[in-house]
């Protein structure tokens, strides 16, 4: 194809006449805005085809693209075409008129688009603005096409100055349909409800502007439809929520509730399910075992924990020896009940720096209008053993006695031992255990007393040694579950002048 003049861009005077010629080896035709304007077609003797387009009395509205293409009825495979762009600077025409569809630009992804505001004069300076603002946007301009770039979801206008007159274009609206892969989350105000209470579920989708929600639920299967409500969460762009509300639940409403979300732009979908349980009446159930005897160590802190599940939320009380406990101002007792999941609770009684007086019978009671449960245990305060006294004496009978007295809770065990070789024992040689055996020539007598007020045991043990022929280190060791204590005394023979 040969076009004269060749272009590709021409600037012509307003009111003038101009002739465009196109020739080729097959029939050719001029096109303007997808139409064929009146033109003269001819075939020369050499077989060359031509078309002459005469533009008369030019105005700014003649500005635009002109194409010459093969008009081939023989079906030759050719898509060759020549493009020419003509400007007719015309002060009476501001921006070239747009088709309505050019003013509305629709996108489903971030992509470059063109805002097609065009002028008749390639020398004019054109700027792009948001409709609401005066600041010119830094977007490149092509006089033949308009502004091209990545645009926000906004409305835009173009501005230019013709002579001393500022001219605005029509507004161009960019609509971006926000779509992304769908990720659904479903939650319920409560997953356990009593019959007669409400079931409320929410299904939320983020990052999509256009979605369809479909709920499946037990009632639907029996043909009893519930109309969900869809809303847009305020202050959260592209957060859409569907709410399914079932008033006055029945036992048959127990089961799986599924929210299925689809968007048709990219044909994405996702679904999530949640289980709802409708109970006839409320309940309180203990979880796990708590032994009927619990222990705490004197002056240490101890937390006693009870785990249970309940619906609706219960009231929790603790008692000691049938008296209600509360948080003490002195900080000696702390009570707390935590909701660790929708229906699971942990109730804790913390005794700070335990005292002997805190031993006793404890009860935790959890209750509401439908049910109650209670759990009781005895708290024993364990006291580490102390050896309070270790003394040696020489009765007239000739034997020698050693007396050991100590206290503790639980009941202490007593162990007697002796070292006969004071130089090597106990470092090199182990002490010898003493007890009720004839070869040791020792006898043991032990008495145990329980002191109610102090809530601990006292152990008094007397060791009788038949004859002592050389100095002897005698050791008394008291032991219980929370500790041990030892004292020793040197026992010397009667014959020696010193004790």
């Amino acid at each position: 194809l040969v076009v004269t003049p060749p272009g590709p861009e021409l600037v012509l005077n307003v009111s003038s006449t101009f002739v465009l010629t196109c020739s080729g080896s097959a029939p050719v035709v001029w096109e303007r805005m997808s139409q064929e304007p009146p033109q003269e077609m001819a075939k020369a003797q050499d077989g060359t085809f031509s078309s002459v387009l005469t533009l008369t009395n030019l105005t700014g509205l003649d500005t635009g693209e002109y194409f010459c293409t093969h008009n081939d009825s023989r079906g030759l495979e050719t898509d060759e075409r020549k493009r020419l762009y003509i400007f007719v600077p015309d002060p009476t025409v501001g921006f070239l008129p747009n088709d309505a569809e050019e003013l509305f630009i629709f996108l489903t992804e971030i992509t470059e688009i063109t805002i097609p505001c065009r002028v008749t004069d390639p020398q004019l300076v054109v700027t792009l603005h948001e409709k609401k603002g005066d600041v010119a946007l830094p977007v490149p301009y092509d006089h033949q096409r308009g502004f091209s770039g990545i645009f926000e979801d906004r409305s835009y206008i173009c501005k230019t100055t013709i002579g001393d007159r500022e001219v605005d274009s029509d507004a161009y609206y960019v609509y971006r349909l926000q779509v992304s892969s769908i990720n659904v989350s479903v939650n319920a105000v409560q997953t356990v409800v009593r019959q007669g209470e409400n079931i409320t579920l929410m299904c939320i989708v983020i990052g999509n502007e256009v979605v369809n929600f479909e709920w499946t639920y037990p009632r639907k299967e029996s043909g009893r439809l519930v109309e969900p409500v869809t809303d847009f969460l305020l202050d959260m762009p592209y957060h859409i929520r569907s709410i399914l509300h079932i008033p006055s639940a029945e036992l048959e409403d127990s089961g799986t509730y599924t929210c299925n979300v689809t968007e048709s732009v990219n044909d994405h979908q996702d679904e999530k399910a949640i289980n709802i349980t409708v109970v006839e009446s409320g309940y309180v159930r203990l979880l796990g075992e708590v032994g009927t005897l619990q222990f705490a160590e004197l002056h240490r802190s101890r937390t006693l924990q009870v785990v249970f599940e309940a619906y609706p939320p219960p009231t929790v009380l603790w008692f000691k020896d049938n008296r209600t406990l509360g948080d003490s101002s002195a900080g000696e007792i702390a009570l707390s009940t935590r909701n660790v999941s929708e229906t699971r609770y942990v109730s804790e009684l913390t005794l700070v720096r335990v005292k002997v007086a805190e031993a006793g019978h404890y009860t935790m009671r959890a209750f509401h209008e439908d049910a109650e449960v209670q759990l009781s245990f005895q708290l024993q305060i364990n006291v580490p053993v102390r050896v309070l006294e270790l003394s040696e004496s020489h009765p007239d009978s000739g034997e020698q006695t050693v007396r050991c007295r100590g206290r503790g809770m639980p009941q202490p065990n007593i162990i007697w031992s002796a070292c006969r070789d004071l130089k090597r024992c106990p470092r090199e040689l182990p002490p010898t255990l003493l007890g009720n055996s004839s070869e040791e020539e020792s006898q043991l007598e032990t008495n145990v007393t329980y002191w109610e007020e102090e809530q601990e045991f006292e152990v008094v043990s007397t060791l009788r040694l038949q004859h002592v022929d050389r100095p002897l280190s005698v050791r008394c060791t008291l032991r219980n579950a929370v500790g041990q204590d030892t004292q020793e005394v040197i026992v010397v023979p009667h014959s020696l002048p010193f004790k």
């Epitope: 629709f106 409709k131 979801d153 906004r154 409305s155 609206y173 960019v174 609509y175 349909l177």
Partner: nanobody, 116 residues
Framework: QVQLVQSGAEVKKPGASVKVSCKAS????????MSWVRQAPGQGLEWMGW????????NYAQKFQERVTITRDMSTSTAYMELSSLRSEDTAVYYC?????????WGQGTLVTVSS
């Protein structure tokens, strides 16, 4: 918050007409025009037409000029799009959309299926 809620899915026979509604809430209906757009399976978005909210003026895409009518009812803040002489190629999801100047808002879409 601006919200556009469209009518439900429709199944129509070729040659019939369909009328889709779009109810607006959360803004002054008169302040924004309403566009109608469609998306056929596997295709991009296609603008059909627009109605001015204040005076009811309409603009239609050339392709739909003869077959589409867009109207609005100010009292209920609802816009309507009617497409006549339906053919199988009109099977698509139809959206209403409005522009608030600083962002656009869309209806959830209405699937129209044309099948004999």
């Amino acid at each position: 918050q601006v919200q556009l809620v469209q009518s439900g899915a429709e199944v129509k026979k070729p040659g019939a007409s369909v009328k889709v509604s779009c109810k607006a809430s959360g803004y002054t209906f008169i302040s924004h025009g309403m566009s109608w757009v469609r998306q056929a399976p596997g295709q991009g978005l296609e603008w059909m037409g627009w109605i001015s909210a204040d005076n009811g003026n309409t603009n239609y895409a050339q392709k739909f000029q003869e077959r589409v009518t867009i109207t609005r009812d100010m009292s209920t803040s609802t816009a309507y799009m009617e497409l006549s002489s339906l053919r199988s190629e009109d099977t698509a999801v139809y959206y209403c959309a409005t522009h608030g100047g600083d962002r656009s808002y869309w209806g959830q879409g209405t699937l129209v299926t044309v099948s004999s």
